[in-house]
């Protein structure tokens, strides 16, 4: 601990100029004091000024006020400094001296004398507040006032706690009154050195090094620091921890960029057909009737249907078809007939019925023989019920659909996929083909499977003409044109006419 | 008991970059009562303080040195780091890593044994 | 630029001799000064820390005192392990700094 026992002398009192043993000052007492501060003892004896000792210089001849002086010799109020822990109670005695020698220093001089002597015992608490004391006896009187405080940075009820405010990284603080810390604004903790970070900094995956900041720990962002940070590349997808890559719905693959829904997303089939998923950017496009093309985006004529019945012949209009009705025969599909049994219309051994009072007929096929007058011999493929550009045979009684590669099913309808397992590297596109997945390598790769890395980049001069898209490793070359619809050629240099309008079969 | 150990090449070239490793033992680096520091001495001279780093990574550097001083932490692996660069004759010292208290007042209780770093062609 | 000044630089002092050294800065007394007892070819180690406080293992005869520019280490009755250089060292705002140092000998 530390403090100082102030002592203010206010105004001494000899009117008669006279000493303690009762001789009188020639020509007046001229006055200085002597201080003891000792521990409280019950019954004052002589010995060491155990708490501390002061004299002052001469303050006045006889009686005198003693004016306050912060510096210099004659200093008041008088400073008794303690390193030690205060311990509220004391011992002091003042006595005023008369010295014929010095004004200054007086404690030197010889023949000094006695005047008066006052002592007080007693308890004292450590403030601000002075207490003010007058002592008389039979020739003088002493008016004086006194105090303890604490030392710069020593604090409380007896100034034992040391505490020296900082502002720097061992802390961040005022001293409070007893001592103890006062944090500034934006410091908390024992010595005030952890800074109050951001408000809903995650506590966690955040810190600060200064009051009001969020730092992220690595793979944390987000000005709180509570959005984790997905995996590097991860295309369509989240996380609930660091480098995580969660595939949104319809995406897959290690950086979610595979498309597993590609008809949702790109809706590529057109005129109503229905749209098939099959596997990463995969996907089957079934038409409806009147439609044609990898996405029925090709009109089939009006007549593929053959809507003219009894052998009437089909003729496309601008947005319908006419039927030319062969002789006997009449209305919209020529599903009429002049004709009656007497003119024998049923080919193919068919049997004739009259109807309608004998104005019209109906003939009665044998078996695989089917029409009006069981003129067409019965197709099982008319209804074109093998998908994905199946051929349809007929064998006897039944038929059967012969699948092109990559698909299967009784009508085709099953896709087989040989990218299923993602066989190409590097990044390269699989298309399923008759012989095998077949891969299409972005620039700087080659090889069935784009393993092969090129030094040269065969597309890299743009070899492909009217708008074709170049890639490398599909053939010796190192090149291949991939033609828009119109062109042809090795480099898609050629136009061409349109593709021949499909066949009517009668 | 704690202790501190330093490491790295005992010469350096004039213009190059001196790098020091201070590996503590026997206590964490992250815990929060302190700061790690590299003080210097230079042959027959006084201590001289270039600065220090907490586990989060804040740093304090001399700024007689500061352009030329990166300090950083690895609490993986309980370790921090001293980086000078452009280093010249007179950064010739032997350098301490040492254990800056918070509850000492910044006091330095433990040290390293130091290493002996000259820098000559 | 905060400057410490120890006086003396050296001092050779007889065993059971008391020893004081100084160290000298602006309004030291406000800041919280530690001492460091440094042996040739040894790390220092520190003495005094918080003014006046000795680490546990540091000898009673070690004593410190800090108030307006001075800070003071008193040896009460050196030893002949107590032949070393001694340094202070405070903190200005977040930089560390040290005092010259103060070499104590033994006659």
């Known amino acids: 601990g530390s403090g100082i026992f102030q002592l203010r002398l206010q105004e001494f009192v000899n009117q008669r100029g006279m000493l303690a043993n009762g001789q009188s000052c020639e020509p007046g007492c001229r006055t200085f004091f002597r201080i003891c501060l000792k521990h409280f003892q019950a019954t004052f004896s002589e010995g060491p000024c155990t708490f501390g000792n002061v004299s002052t210089p001469v303050l006045g001849t006889n009686s005198f006020v003693v004016r306050d002086k912060n510096s210099g010799s004659g200093r008041n109020p008088l400073q008794l400094p303690f390193n030690f822990t205060w311990p509220g109670t004391f011992s002091l005695n003042i006595q005023a001296w008369h010295t014929p020698g010095d004004d200054l220093r007086p404690e030197t001089s010889p023949g000094n004398s006695l005047i008066s002597q006052i002592i007080i015992q007693g308890s004292l608490a450590v403030g601000k507040i002075w207490r003010t004391d007058e002592q008389n006896d039979t020739l003088t009187r002493l008016s004086y006032s006194y105090r303890v405080i604490c030392s710069d940075n020593y604090y409380g009820e007896s100034c034992s706690r040391l505490c020296k405010k900082r502002d720097d990284h061992f802390g961040h603080y005022e001293c409070q009154p007893d001592g103890s810390l006062s944090c500034l604004p934006g410091w908390t903790g024992k010595y005030c050195d952890q800074p109050i970070c951001l408000s809903g900094c995650h506590e966690q995956n955040g810190y600060c090094s200064k009051p009001d900041e969020c730092i992220c720990r690595p793979g944390w962002q987000g000005r709180l620091c509570n959005e984790c940070i997905p995996h590097n590349g991860c295309r369509h997808g989240t996380c609930s921890i660091p480098w995580q890559c969660a595939c949104d719905e319809g995406w897959g693959g290690l950086f979610c960029d595979q498309d597993l829904n590609y008809c949702t997303h790109h809706s590529p089939c057109k005129n109503g057909s229905t749209c098939s998923n099959s596997g990463p950017k995969g996907y089957t496009c079934t038409c409806l009737p009147g439609y044609t093309g990898e996405h029925c985006e090709l009109g089939l004529s009006k007549c593929a249907s053959n809507p003219c019945r009894n052998g009437g012949s089909c003729k496309d209009q601008e947005n319908s078809y006419h039927c030319l009705c062969p002789p006997g025969y009449y209305g919209q599909h020529c599903e009429h007939s002049t004709l009656t049994c007497a003119d024998s219309p049923c080919f193919n051994g068919g049997s004739c019925r009259e109807r309608n009072q004998g104005s019209s007929y109906a003939c009665e096929c044998p078996p695989n023989f089917t029409g009006s007058n069981c003129e067409k011999k019965v197709d099982r493929c008319t209804s074109n019920p093998c998908a994905n550009g199946g051929q349809c045979q007929n064998r006897g009684p039944s038929r059967t659909c012969r699948c092109r590669p990559g698909f299967t099913g009784t009508h085709c309808e099953l896709h087989i996929s040989d990218c299923a397992r993602s066989p190409c590297a590097h990044g390269g596109t699989c298309h399923d083909l008759e012989n095998g997945p077949v891969c299409t390598c972005p620039a700087g790769f080659s090889g069935r499977r784009c393993e092969v890395r090129i030094t040269h980049d065969a597309c890299a001069s743009g070899p492909c003409f009217n708008g074709a898209t170049c890639y490398t490793g599909l053939s010796p070359n190192n090149f291949v044109c991939n033609c828009p619809y119109g062109f042809v050629g090795s480099r898609c240099e050629f136009p061409v006419g349109l593709p021949p309008s499909f066949p009517w079969v009668a | 008991e704690v202790q501190l150990q330093e490491s790295g090449p005992g010469l350096v070239k004039p213009g190059e970059t001196l790098s020091l490793t201070c590996t503590v033992s026997?206590?964490?680096?992250?815990?929060?009562?302190?700061?790690w520091g590299w003080i210097r001495q230079a042959p027959g001279k006084g201590l001289e303080w270039i600065g220090d780093i907490y586990y989060t990574g804040s740093t304090y550097y001399n700024p007689s040195l500061k352009s030329r001083v990166t300090i950083s932490v690895d609490t993986s692996k309980n370790q921090f780091y001293l980086k000078l660069s452009s280093v010249r004759a007179e950064d010739t010292a032997v350098y301490y890593c040492a254990r800056e208290d918070v509850i000492l007042r910044g006091g330095s209780d433990y040290w390293g044994q130091g290493t002996l770093v000259t820098v000559s062609s | 630029e905060y400057v410490l000044t120890q006086s003396p630089d050296f001092q050779s002092v007889t065993p059971k001799e008391k020893v004081t050294i100084t160290c000298s800065g602006q309004r030291l007394g406000d800041k919280y000064a530690s001492w460091y007892q440094q042996k040739p070819d040894q790390s220092p180690k520190l003495v005094i820390y918080e003014d006046s406080k000795r680490p546990s293992g540091v000898p009673s005869r070690f004593s410190g005192s800090n108030s307006g520019d001075d800070a003071t280490l008193t040896i009460n009755s050196l030893e002949a392990e107590d032949a070393a250089t001694y340094y202070c060292q405070a903190w200005d705002r977040d930089t560390g700094v040290f005092g010259q140092g103060t070499k104590v000998e033994i006659k």
């Open positions: 026997g206590g964490s680096i992250s815990s929060s009562s302190y700061y």
